[in-house]
Interface confidence: low
């Protein structure tokens, strides 16, 4: 048995509701915290030493409609110097998350769950070597 | 790279209105905004917008009185400037961003036009 976390509430079902398909539901799109900003330090994809730039990827028929992708600049990492150094890698940090994709079907719009592998950023890694025998 | 063009700007007496418009070259769905920069001060940050024009963001000294706007199919970004005050003579630029993270920070915005004046005087 789950227990609910302070202030949250696990909703039961009146047995008077009328059953919903399977699988299904109602989706409100309206944002909880929307103004809810991530605080993030500032240029910290410039100062980094695996740098990278971010795109904002648009998509009309996804919610949200608006995701950023980051992209990492160099394939090696940026010494104390600016140089870049290729005896270490930059490699991009992915976070699976769920979208929302639009379908429409006749008149009626539904919407699907869709998974989004989305590159917050990149780091710097010790390359992988393979040591021949 | 993105060039950006603002267009618009003018005399005009306080109390009145003007539209500035932006015209960017090359599609680009980047978050973008209207900071200005009165003489001798800083530049600050006026209004800002994300890529599909769903989420503003305004300086409360601007907040009632402007409406940040764009149109993807033109690319333009548009600054409806209503009620103006004296306070708000300034040079307006466009700018691009790559999120709505800290869209006051005037630091954070990159691919800058050149501007257009805005003077407010009776």
């Known amino acids: 048995q789950r227990v609910p976390k302070e202030g949250q509430t696990f909703f039961q079902k009146p047995e008077s509701c009328p059953s919903v398909p399977e699988g299904s539901l109602k989706l409100d799109l309206g944002i909880i915290n929307a103004n809810q900003r991530v605080p993030l330090s500032r240029n910290i994809e410039r100062r980094s030493t695996s740098p990278w730039n971010y795109t904002v990827t648009w998509d009309p028929n996804r919610y949200p409609s608006e995701v950023v992708q980051a992209q990492c600049r160099h394939l090696g990492c940026v010494n104390a110097q600016g140089k870049e150094d290729i005896f270490m890698n930059s490699v991009p940090i992915q976070q699976e998350t769920l979208v929302l994709r639009r379908k429409h079907q006749g008149c009626s719009v539904s919407f699907q769950l869709e998974k989004l592998l989305v590159t917050v950023g990149c780091t710097c890694v010790k390359p992988l070597i393979h040591h021949v025998h | 790279e993105v060039q950006l063009v603002e267009s618009g700007g003018g005399l005009v007496q306080p109390g009145g209105s003007l539209r500035l418009s932006c015209a960017a070259s090359?599609?680009?769905?980047?978050?973008m905004g209207w900071l200005r920069q009165a003489p001798g001060k800083e530049r600050e940050f006026v209004a800002a917008?994300?890529?599909?024009?769903?989420?503003?963001y305004y300086a409360d000294s601007v907040k009632g009185r402007f409406t940040i706007s764009r149109d993807n199919s033109k690319n333009t970004l548009y600054l409806q400037m209503n009620s103006l005050r004296p306070e708000d003579t300034a040079v307006y630029y466009c700018?691009?961003?790559?999120?709505?993270?800290?869209?006051?920070?005037?630091?954070?915005?990159?691919?800058w036009g050149q501007g257009t004046l805005v003077t407010v005087s009776s």
């Open positions: 090359g599609r680009t769905y980047d978050a």
């Open positions: 917008i994300s890529g599909s024009g769903d989420d503003t």
């Open positions: 700018a691009t961003r790559r999120g709505l993270y800290y869209v006051w920070d005037a630091n954070d915005y990159e691919n």
